[in-house]
Interface confidence: low
Amino acid sequence: SPVPFGPEGRLEDKLHKPKATQTEVKPSVRFNLRTSKDPEHEGCYLSVGHSQPLEDCSFNMTAKTFFIIHGWTMSGIFENWLHKLVSALHTREKDANVVVVDWLPLAHQLYTDAVNNTRVVGHSIARMLDWLQEKDDFSLGNVHLIGYSLGAHVAGYAGNFVKGTVGRITGLDPAGPMFEGADIHKRLSPDDADFVDVLHTYTRSFGLSIGIQMPVGHIDIYPNGGDFQPGCGLNDVLGSIAYGTITEVVKCEHERAVHLFVDSLVNQDKPSFAFQCTDSNRFKKGICLSCRKNRCNSIGYNAKKMRNKRNSKMYLKTRAGMPFRVYHYQMKIHVFSYKNMGEIEPTFYVTLYGTNADSQTLPLEIVERIEQNATNTFLVYTEEDLGDLLKIQLTWEGASQSWYNLWKEFRSYLSQPRNPGRELNIRRIRVKSGETQRKLTFCTEDPENTSISPGRELWFRKCRDGWRMKNETSPTVELP
């Protein structure tokens, strides 16, 4: 579905009956068993109490069964993402049953009405599952509901209403408006399945959040902080409305959750890993790259089942397109002294040199400020696998890039006209790979030269001792 925006409203207990004045097709829910990867193929329609289609269409009672649940729809037809997901599931799980839940007539309405219909659609899915459970060999534990946008909450209702517990629900950017802060029985929640994993790709802390911001699963993964997705164009979505690009930007970021999931199905040799962290800012600082005590996990289909006492928020960076995997590094830089720093923060870049490849020049994002006589932690990530790291080039950018910084420099100069030059002293850089969990220490090439100043660079090589502390468990891929 495109985006869960439409007029609006809060989720209501009482289901609104579709208005008699609407001339659309009578509201219904249909279950289409996809018997082919071909989107044009008709598939088989399943209905409660009718066993013949199960036999005619070779429904495999002992195999995994996926239910794909779309969300609110503007066009009234299935969109491309759904065909891609069906195809990816067929490719990955050849014997599985892939069922598309078609609730288009109920979803192709004003958003408020579509939301009010989610409950009845959830009931329909639960009834189908209850009926299937009456068959020999069918196990609810083999059922995986995959819901996108409003469909994620439909999956929640289905999991809530079914007799027993479904194996897994994956929420792909569950809808935000009317669900944010809602009671657990009125939205997707960890109670709805044995394992509930969620990808959040379009959350906003300002204005309206199309995707739900709050954690709603056992694990909630926020790629790129859960907001601005690389490759989705304009950052200021609201500012772009006037230029007609809101559709593309919103669709790109909201739908990114689906493509990340598809990526996890078709590129299982390039799994993306997410790391548990209390918030996005801490993750950006590079603090959260641990895999100890289940603190990291594969994202998407390959996620390992984790049933935490409370929601686990996890973060990762991604590329702009498939395969989305990047390689995360924590960089700990101990600044043991600095001179004449003035008001402005330095702008640092690093280049990592490895046995397989060298990185591009990567900015070190200063989330707060550089601390003196303290270890400053940064997150950097590369799109390519560098292999084992050999050396690091640290560069302090010379000329200021912003008028604000230029102004601060000028003010600094006025107050200290004989500023003898800004300088920082760094002896070593500690690096930890998120993907391998290996830790290394890099020392300055020349132990006598540890200072760096604007426009200059410092080179670091692996120290002799290597600082290979206790290896933590690496995020091995456990295929479901």
Epitope: P7, K19, Q22, S75, G76, L110, Y111, T112, I241
Partner: antibody, heavy 119, light 106 residues
Framework: QVQLVQSGAEVKKPGASVKVSCKAS????????MHWVRQAPGQGLEWMGS????????SYNEKFKDRVTMTRDTSTSTVYMELSSLRSEDTAVYYC????????????WGQGTTVTVSS | EIVLTQSPGTLSLSPGERATLSCRAS?????MYWYQQKPGQAPRLLIY???NLAPGIPDRFSGSGSGTDFTLTISRLEPEDFAVYYC?????????FGGGTKVEIK
């Protein structure tokens, strides 16, 4: 640039019908619902109904449902609103308004078409 | 249908003054939308989802409220702000508008 251009003013006799057009440009016509809102002289705004250009699904205000018909022509990116059995109280300015489905409000409006019903 | 009642019907103020416009719904609505209309022109969206400023609208406009009571505030009236303001609900069909509040120069 998004534009909604409506047909010109109409003068009709009571009991007759009027068909107002609204031609859309500057965006993908089938991706946004079009609504019709009218405003009688010196009065407020009144929602009449909507049409989804993708497959022609309509939703009408109960007050008008026996007299209003909304259609669309995707080849020309135009929506039409026909009101039958006209009476003097139907004298108003009729606006088409694009409903921004990705943001949930009337984000662009036509310039309005004045329909006068007089014997 | 949900009836929206706007008050006052007319507000006479001078440029630079603060304007507070009220919209009351006959039953609870989820969000409120506000439009500005000048003579001979189509309405223009100001506020959506109760408190979100539409693109290109100056921040002297703000919206608030919940349930049945909603408010549009113009912190300092500019000459171009003198117009008629309508509230609207999308909670329940038919999607109704308020009767309007005319903000005129004192």
């Amino acid at each position: 640039q998004v534009q909604l251009v409506q047909s010109g003013a109409e003068v009709k006799k009571p009991g007759a019908s009027v068909k107002v057009s609204c031609k859309a440009s500057g965006y993908t016509f089938t991706e946004y619902t079009m609504h019709w809102v009218r405003q009688a002289p010196g009065q407020g705004l009144e929602w009449m109904g909507s049409i989804n250009p993708y497959y022609g699904g309509t939703s009408y205000n109960e007050k008008f449902k026996d007299r209003v018909t909304m259609t669309r022509d995707t080849s020309t990116s135009t929506v039409y609103m026909e009101l039958s059995s006209l009476r003097s109280e139907d004298t108003a300015v009729y606006y088409c308004a694009r409903y921004g489905n990705y943001v949930g409000y009337f984000d662009y409006w036509g310039q309005g078409t004045t329909v006068t019903v007089s014997s | 249908e949900i009836v929206l009642t706007q008050s006052p019907g007319t507000l006479s103020l001078s440029p630079g003054e603060r304007a507070t416009l009220s919209c009351r719904a006959s039953s609870s609505v989820h969000y409120m939308y506000w439009y500005q209309q000048k003579p001979g022109q189509a309405p223009r969206l100001l506020i959506y989802y109760t408190s979100n400023l539409a693109p290109g609208i100056p921040d002297r406009f703000s919206g608030s409220g919940s349930g049945t009571d909603f408010t549009l505030t113009i912190s300092r009236l500019e000459p171009e702000d003198f117009a008629v303001y309508y509230c609207q609900q999308f909670t329940s069909s038919p999607y109704t508008f308020g009767g309007g509040t005319k903000v005129e120069i004192k």
